[in-house]
């Protein structure tokens, strides 16, 4: 009996530019002889419904169709037919199929590969064209993929130390697509500093599929309107 096992759940998520290993394990009732077996990896893009060959291993000879694609011949002996792709790109997401032939038997498995890019976040203070006592803080998130992203603003005062979400005076712009396929977006918070308590901590909170925990950038409102503590300047402002 010949069986192929791929990633549990049928989906693998990998960061952009990572050296990804797409799992494929072979289970066979007898010891594997790699000189008399064949492995073929296929890829079907998300954008066009055509399956193309990425890698082929047959009779101890291997052929890479994508630069750097490789199945370790050493690991193959113990049934590991995982495909390694260095420097994975957004466009290489899609369905990967591992086909194993141990004559006369054939087995295959498929997995969806999702390529994600984590956002980088920075805070900026924009005072251009603002009225007296009014400040505009911009939270820029850049280089993320997929497009779906959630940006919120929170504040913590000395009276209420638990974060409170701010819903007023927040404007989040449209997502902009970069040349490399990733996205950028900016969210703005308008503050009237005369109506806010000094010591209030404001946070821009970014949630994205690529992040295990939200990305937080913060600033503290001080008595002197625009002065920021050194730690805030160093850690959160570019």
């Amino acid at each position: 009996d010949l069986k192929v096992e791929m990633m549990a759940g049928g989906t693998q998520i990998t960061p952009l530019n990572d050296n990804v290993t797409i799992f494929c394990n072979i289970f066979y009732s007898q010891p594997l002889n790699i000189t008399s077996m064949g492995i073929t990896w296929f890829w079907k893009s998300l954008t066009f419904d055509k399956e193309v060959k990425v890698f082929e291993f047959f009779g101890d000879h291997q052929e890479a169709f994508r630069p750097g694609a490789i199945v370790s011949p050493w690991r193959l002996k113990s049934g590991d037919a995982s495909l390694r792709l260095p420097g994975i790109q957004l466009e290489e997401a899609g369905e990967y199929r591992c086909e194993v032939v141990v004559t006369p038997l054939k087995a295959q498995g498929t997995v969806q590969l999702e390529v994600v890019a984590s956002p980088a976040s920075r805070l900026l203070l924009d005072q251009v064209g603002m009225k007296e006592n009014e400040d505009k803080y911009m939270c820029e998130s850049s280089g993320f993929y997929p497009e779906a992203i959630n940006i919120t603003w929170e504040k913590q005062t000395q009276k209420f130390p638990h974060p409170i979400e701010i819903s007023e005076d927040v404007i989040t712009g449209p997502t902009i697509k970069n040349m490399d396929g990733t996205f950028n977006v900016t969210s703005c918070l308008k503050l009237n500093s005369s109506q806010e308590d000094p010591g209030t901590v404001y946070q821009c909170v970014v949630r994205h599929a690529s992040l295990h925990t939200p990305l937080r950038s913060n600033f503290t409102l001080t008595a002197a309107r625009h002065s920021l503590s050194e730690t805030e300047k160093t850690d959160n402002f570019s």
Epitope: Q62, A64, F65, P67, G68, A69, I70, P73, P86, G87
Partner: antibody
């Protein structure tokens, strides 16, 4: 038989652009990747980028982003690399290559010498 | 980027000699190491891939070994046609990088 035939030598002025070609045969071009590499006289090789002919998707070495631009013409099975804002540092032999048995650069073109001189 | 270092830039040997060319990576490249031969006319071909696997049609006098950061190419019985420059290349991480090359000459 897999073949990659590159265009002839180029003498160009600083600031100009040059477009090199790599005509292929012996394999299915539309589902292949073509890489470009640079070798300055008497020096080592540098990987510039690759292009997937099926979609035109590219992957660049950051060092060459903005300097090199890769394109393909599937009807003639030809890959192109345009090098812009040339300086004397760009004087080199440029190779096209495609992956094969175990290697990202298994089949090579004969190289094109580009000389940048005023 | 991963730096590849070939400490010997040129090497002189006699026909029939056993020649070893070494290559060091700036970090562990997990055996993703290929060797190329460049003839004086500029022609390039692959000799070895994945550290030790002989490319189709390459004579068996060529062999490769190594692990981690240190790798070597051995020519067991040097022939006239082996006069060339040899480059190592890491295939572990993009951008792919090459060693500076070792030029092999006849004594």
């Amino acid at each position: 038989q897999i073949q990659l035939q590159q265009s002839g030598p180029e003498l160009v002025k600083p600031g100009a652009s040059v477009k090199l070609s790599c005509k292929t045969s012996g394999f299915t071009f539309s589902s292949s990747y073509i890489s470009w590499l640079k070798q300055k006289p008497g020096q080592s090789l540098e990987w510039i980028a690759w292009i997937y002919a099926g979609t035109g998707n590219t992957n660049y070495n950051q060092k060459f982003t903005g300097k090199a631009q890769l394109t393909v013409d599937t009807s003639s099975s030809t890959a192109y690399m345009q090098f812009s804002s040339l300086t004397t540092e760009d004087s080199a032999i440029y190779y096209c290559a495609r992956p094969g048995e175990g290697s990202p650069f298994a089949y090579w073109g004969q190289g094109t010498l580009v000389t940048v001189s005023a | 980027d991963i730096q590849m270092t070939q400490t010997t830039s040129s090497l002189s040997a006699s026909l029939g000699d056993r020649v070893t060319i070494s290559c060091r990576a700036s970090q562990d490249i997990s055996n993703y190491l290929n060797w190329y031969q460049q003839k004086p006319d500029g022609t390039v071909k692959v000799l070895i891939y994945y550290t030790s696997r002989l490319y189709s049609g390459v004579p068996s006098r060529f062999s490769g070994s190594g692990s981690g950061t240190d790798y070597s190419l051995t020519i067991s019985n040097l022939e006239q046609e082996d006069i060339a420059t040899y480059f190592c290349q890491q295939g572990d991480t993009l951008p792919y990088t090459f060693g500076g090359g070792t030029k092999l000459e006849i004594k």
